[in-house]
């Protein structure tokens, strides 16, 4: 099916930018992996690069405005022709749910004091208004609450005095049309306009002042233009060459408003002076290689020694990574394929341990399933041996950092009947539903 093709994908917002045009296939649009596409206008924007997870969205508002609630955030698998980590198809959403508390307490209403006295009337003649007020302190509201109703009220008041009305001009009426619209006619064109003393009229009792000045105004029509000539388009010029060497580009044709040129205020040519077309090089754009994440560290060993575990003997270990996705003469990955470091092996070593403080509360799991809960833990943490943190391997090469490696066997006193992990669970409250934000916008 044809799609809308764009030249940019904005990672921060997930929006398509720089519309190239419609009516092309996903495969043709994605000849350039920097491009992006939409299946319909306003629909989900997918970049042409290989799929990966978007940034997490911001946390949604807390499901309640006071006391403890829950909130969701999501990320989306975006890209084309592949899957995200976890073998997830493009377009799929992943959710996280956490507990939240916007405000510890909930608002409580206050009560009004009695009304104060009426203030004087707002005018000295005719009718006006007067006002009285009351205070929200009987009792005062708590935790951001308020009192129901208004803090002041007004009513009409009459001074029993008549006010004089002074006359004022209404706005000028329009100029009457000139007798000719182009210059060169037999009569000298004139135009006239008038106004009324009606905004307002002056009062009789008590007497108001009349409007100052004249009710009519006349002038000569000057500077009339010569009669106009409308502009007309010349022929379309040649099509510009395709500006790209791979993927899709945009060519342009131009025309000039000179057939004839507009004169004496005649209208400019209607329509566009340029028009564009999509051009297809049919050449896929280079795709640069990208490093996979580092693999696991190999076991910590020392040559010609069977085992160095639980000993103050430094060894070496390495890890590797793979350059993936390079196609169509793209750049190879920069940097090293292998990483080597010095290490002490504490694999399966019995070490004295101590209980950690409680961890922070984890995310609510499952985020979209029934009855989500959150947990926190205390872990039996090993006390690492006080081996030298650096070693000098070869003279003249300086000191090298040494890292502990392996899973030791920590020993702690029993805590709540447990030797390694103590866990506390708690239900998540006021859980909102997981809804696709793209579908919510429709």
């Amino acid at each position: 099916d044809p799609v809308l093709c764009f030249t940019q994908y904005e990672e921060s917002s997930g929006k398509c930018k720089g519309l190239l045009g419609g009516g092309v296939s996903v495969e043709d649009c994605c000849l350039n992996t920097a491009f992006a596409y939409q299946k319909r206008s306003g629909g989900l924007c997918q970049p042409c690069r290989s799929p990966r997870w978007s940034l997490w969205s911001t946390w949604a508002p807390c499901s309640v405005t006071c006391s403890e609630g829950s909130q969701l955030r999501y990320r989306r698998c975006v890209g084309w022709n592949g899957q995200c980590s976890g073998k997830v198809a493009p377009g799929t959403l992943e959710w996280q749910l956490q507990a939240c508390e916007d405000q510890q307490c909930c608002p409580e209403m206050g009560g009004w004091s009695g009304w104060g006295p009426w203030e004087p009337c707002s005018v000295t003649c005719s009718k006006g208004t007067r006002t009285r007020r009351r205070a929200c302190n009987h009792p005062a509201p708590k935790c951001g609450g308020h009192c129901p109703g208004q803090a002041q009220e007004s009513e009409a008041c009459d001074t029993q005095q008549v006010c004089p009305t002074h006359g004022a001009w209404a706005t000028w009426g329009p100029w009457t049309p000139c007798s000719a619209s182009c210059h060169g006619g037999p009569h000298e064109p004139k135009e006239t306009r008038s106004r009324k003393c009606s905004a307002p009229e002056p009062s009789q009792k008590p007497p108001g002042k009349p409007c100052p000045g004249l009710a009519y105004e006349q002038r000569r029509c000057t500077g009339l233009p010569p009669c106009p000539v409308a502009g007309g388009w010349g022929p379309w010029g040649p099509v510009s060459p395709c500006p790209v060497t791979c993927g899709l580009g945009q060519t342009m044709e131009q025309r000039t408003c000179n057939h004839p040129v507009p004169q004496h205020g005649g209208p400019f040519c209607a329509g566009d002076a340029t028009r564009t077309h999509i051009c297809n090089t049919a050449v896929p754009c280079p795709v640069d290689g990208e490093w996979d994440s580092w693999g696991e560290w190999s076991p910590c060993i020392r040559r010609n020694m069977k085992s160095i575990s639980c000993q103050e003997i430094p060894g070496q270990q390495s890890r590797g990574r793979t350059c993936r996705g390079r196609k169509f003469d793209g750049h190879r990955c920069a940097g090293q394929q292998q990483d080597i470091r010095h290490c002490y092996s504490i694999q399966h070593c019995p070490l004295k341990g101590s209980w950690s403080e409680w961890s922070t509360w984890g995310l609510c799991m499952p985020p979209c399933g029934p009855n989500p809960t959150r947990a926190r833990q205390r872990l039996c943490t090993p006390l690492l041996p006080k081996y030298p943190p650096t070693v000098s391997m070869v003279e003249g090469q300086g000191e090298k950092n040494v890292t502990f490696w392996g899973r030791p066997l920590p020993r702690c006193e029993e805590l709540q009947g447990q030797k390694l992990v103590v866990e506390e669970k708690r239900p998540c409250l006021h859980v909102p539903a997981c809804k696709d934000p793209e579908e919510e916008e429709l």
């Epitope: 296939s25 495969e27 043709d28 994605c30 022709n81 592949g82 049919a282 896929p284 196609k327």
Partner: nanobody, 119 residues
Framework: EVQLVESGGGLVQPGGSLRLSCAAS????????MSWVRQAPGKGPEWVSA????????YYAASVKGRFTISRDNAKNTLYLQMNSLKPEDTAVYYC????????????WGQGTLVTVSG
């Protein structure tokens, strides 16, 4: 049994032309995307050109764009590659292949035909 049989290779001088053919059988040729892939002596395979199932869309590597033309005849179950303005660096065994040219996942390959460009 799927079969892809290439022909039309040979020795040609620089600047000359050749037309390669690939006869297909054992699968629905008219609904398959097809590609030409070449392998020069001592090098890895290099994608050259691709065509979609109905022949409406064609694609080329930058190194051959404007000199090579891919086409197909679904009535004859045959794929073609017209090669003009040949250069010594075009010397390779040329294979026709069926599958996804973009991800380079090919399901079936031919046995190949040798093209030598030499003065």
């Amino acid at each position: 049994e799927v079969q892809l049989v290439e022909s039309g290779g040979g020795l040609v001088q620089p600047g000359g032309s050749l037309r390669l053919s690939c006869a297909a059988s054992g699968f629905t040729f008219g609904s398959a995307d097809m590609s030409w892939v070449r392998q020069a002596p001592g090098k890895g395979p290099e994608w050259v050109s691709a065509i979609n199932s109905n022949g409406g869309s064609t694609y080329y590597a930058a190194s051959v764009k404007g000199r090579f033309t891919i086409s197909r005849d679904n009535a004859k179950n045959t794929l073609y590659l017209q090669m003009n303005s040949l250069k010594p660096e075009d010397t390779a065994v040329y294979y026709c292949a069926q599958g996804n040219w973009y991800t380079e996942e090919y399901h079936y390959w031919g046995q190949g035909t040798l093209v030598t460009v030499s003065g």
